[in-house]
């Protein structure tokens, strides 16, 4: 027996303390407590970048990452040659883990992997890799860009030296230098199967907290084909603490990544709980705002040739602009109520703005959790007239996300609208 | 004012390719879609596909592997070509101007139709 | 592919009303054009977008949809409403891409 319903958007920008209200009529706190421990802090709201600062002293600090790289005013680093990398051909071991950090996806790196050269003080070990990714459809999401040009995503390597600390989190609490690697993905239209472990890993830590041991990767085949030419800066972590401890190697070339496998990013999800009161929702944006140069100077690599190749072609967006490769703005005014014990409906309204028109039909995909299961289906709404969508065989006990999305004529899509959340049988979400 | 007329009707022989061109003027194919129908004689409307304003082009399930539509939008023409015809493909051929909208197509300006009769 | 269905033929008598039909074989599709051809003509538009009339089209000629059927109505048929009806609609996208007519209604007034 459904008892009663509460549905609400999901809440994609990290709001904080949002209110709504149940049939009843009683308000439920969907979102967000402040942790006990570390001080909790988010990518927007009100425990937003802006607000990091009063948890994290250092994060208003004059040497913060991440930055727009300017090449024009870099300079060339004769000390900066060419990267020496050890153990980066290997394949990795069965004991490299990816983790939904609720933030972030990161993998854990079990085998030694070193990088030495560049300018950095020693010989470093990589520890663990980062991701960052925007909203959809190859939006910006990278955290450092190259003259104002930004990515969809940015996966970063951290480093320390095993010489002088026995962890990498020793390092960081005693404030002591560590490494990064800034490497950008940009849409192509193939497959890199490269990164198939990778994306394979994604897939089995869609929820927060989630954890999967990946499929054996090579990490030099995530990295650009050609290392010399990158970029030396010195900043700090773009999350809190945000210690200024960091020497940055930021990669002008970028890696390959198809729209389907960015689909498998825009597919995580952060959850919050605070007592009985949960908050489910797409981890997206989840970038830093970027930080000022201050008195700081960037440098470019001095090896040989690497920079003579023309960087028109991924510097130059080959795919034109946002509304060149989606067919529209999102849907919205998205709906879902409930039609008898066992059904609901889901309506929306037209796009605001249909770039490439006419709106054929909608693509109505919705997941649900059930005993730590997660399970997803899409179906075709064929009428463009009828903007509703009757999902039957509703499981009172799981909690369910919606997203509507239209199909042109061209086959293009738009962007997926706002996330409905709908749970049965509960009193609280 | 706004028009477009089709030519290069006439007499074919079975196995021959049709090519039919539709000349618009008043506006611009960069712009705006055209579609291809025809109708036998005493027969109703059939589509056979169309071209929209950025180019990509759309059969009708019988029409594909047979048909090609183009464009040049510089010429402001559009053409039609099929291949392989047969006394069934007698008809006359219009291109109508498509009014595409948010959420809908019709066609809100026909040319007045060249007529393509296939016969040994 | 979908079909739509017409009756062949219809009749009215002059300065009636009649309605002329046109049913989807499957439920809710896209929104229905009509279009009216005269003897040696091209097609013209009637209706767009089930209910909307292209201007210069008199207002005797309206359209409605329910369900998976688009009506054709004529207020007070005159003699040179004479004419084969058709409907169209539109379906699919991408190669699946389709612009469907129905196979038309032949409208005799009478009277």
């Known amino acids: 027996v459904l008892h009663y319903v509460v549905c609400f958007p999901a809440l994609t920008e990290g709001y904080v303390g949002a209110l709504h209200e149940n049939r009843h009529g009683s308000a439920v706190q969907i979102r967000r407590r402040k942790a006990s421990g570390d001080p909790y802090w988010a990518y927007s709201g009100a425990y937003g970048p802006e607000h990091w600062v009063t948890s994290s002293v250092s994060c208003g600090g004059r040497h913060q990452s991440p930055i727009d790289i300017l090449d024009q005013y870099a300079r060339v680093g004769e000390e900066y040659q060419e990267l020496q990398l050890d153990g980066f051909d290997n394949e990795s071991s069965n004991k490299t883990w990816m983790k939904n950090t609720g933030k972030t996806v990161a993998i854990l790196l079990k085998d030694d992997y070193f990088v030495s050269g560049a300018g950095l003080p020693g010989r470093f070990k990589a520890e663990k890799v980062e991701f960052h990714w925007g909203h959809s459809n190859g939006s910006a999401g990278s955290e450092h860009s190259i003259n104002g040009r930004r990515f969809p995503v940015e996966m970063q390597i951290f480093f320390y030296n095993p010489d002088d600390f026995d962890s990498f989190q020793t390092a960081i609490s005693e404030n002591r230098i560590i490494g990064a690697m800034a490497i950008f993905f940009q849409v192509s239209p193939r497959d890199n199967s490269a990164l198939d472990p990778i994306i394979h890993g994604l897939k089995g830590v869609v929820h927060h907290e989630k954890e999967t041991f990946l499929d054996p990767f090579v990490l030099r085949d995530l990295l650009p084909a050609s290392l010399g030419s990158y970029y030396r800066y010195t900043g700090s972590l773009t999350t809190p603490p945000c210690s200024e401890i960091v020497e940055w190697i930021v990669f002008r070339r970028p890696v390959p990544i198809s729209y389907h496998q960015l689909e498998a990013f825009y597919s995580i999800f952060t959850t919050e709980q605070q007592d009985h009161v949960k908050s489910v929702e797409y981890l997206r944006n989840n970038f830093r705002p970027q930080q000022r140069l201050h008195d700081r100077v960037v440098s470019k690599s001095a090896v040989r040739d690497s920079w003579n190749h023309d960087m028109t072609d991924f510097l130059e967006n080959p795919l034109g602009t946002e509304a060149s490769k989606v067919c529209s703005s999102p849907p919205i005014h998205m709906k879902v109520q409930p039609l008898n014990q066992t059904a609901l409906q889901v309506s929306w309204s037209q796009p605001e703005t249909i770039y490439h028109p006419p709106i054929m039909n909608y693509m109505i995909s919705y997941s649900w959790t059930k005993n730590e299961d997660e399970k997803e289906k899409t179906f075709t709404k064929d009428s463009d007239k009828d903007l509703k969508a009757t999902i039957s065989h509703v499981s009172p006990d799981s909690l369910y996300l919606f997203r509507v999305q239209a199909v042109c004529r061209n086959d293009m899509r738009s962007d997926f609208s706002q996330t409905m959340l709908f749970q049965a049988n509960t009193t609280r979400i | 004012q706004e028009q477009q007329k089709e030519s290069g009707g006439g007499l074919f022989k079975p196995t021959d390719t049709l090519t039919l061109t539709c000349t618009v003027s008043?506006?611009?194919?960069?712009?705006?879609?055209i579609s291809w129908v025809r109708q036998a004689p005493g027969n109703g409307l059939e589509w056979i596909g169309a071209?929209?304003?950025?180019?990509?082009?759309y059969y009708a399930t019988w029409a594909k592997g047979r048909s090609t539509i183009t464009r040049a939008t510089n010429l402001n023409t559009v053409t039609l070509k099929m291949t392989s015809v047969t006394a069934a493909d007698t008809a006359t051929y219009f291109c109508?101007?498509?009014?595409?909208?948010?959420?809908?197509?019709?066609?809100?300006?026909w040319g007045p139709g060249t007529l393509v009769t296939i016969s040994s | 592919s979908f079909v739509l269905t017409q009756p062949a033929s219809v009749q009215v008598n002059l300065g009636q009303t009649v309605s002329l039909t046109c049913t989807a074989d499957t439920l809710s599709r896209s929104y229905a054009s009509w279009y009216q051809q005269k003897p040696g003509q091209a097609p013209v538009l009637l209706i767009y977008?089930?209910?909307s009339r292209p201007s210069g089209v008199p207002d005797r000629f309206s359209g409605s949809s329910s369900g998976n059927t688009a009506t054709l109505t004529i207020s007070g048929a005159q003699a040179g409403d004479e004419a084969d009806y058709y409907c169209a609609t539109s379906d699919g996208s991408g190669s699946s891409y389709q612009f469907v007519f129905g196979g038309g209604t032949q409208l005799t007034v009478t009277g």
């Open positions: 109508a101007r498509e009014d595409v909208r948010a959420d809908s197509i019709d066609l809100n300006m």
């Open positions: 977008r089930d209910t």
């Open positions: 071209i929209d304003n950025s180019g990509s082009a």
């Open positions: 008043g506006f611009s194919l960069s712009s705006n879609a």
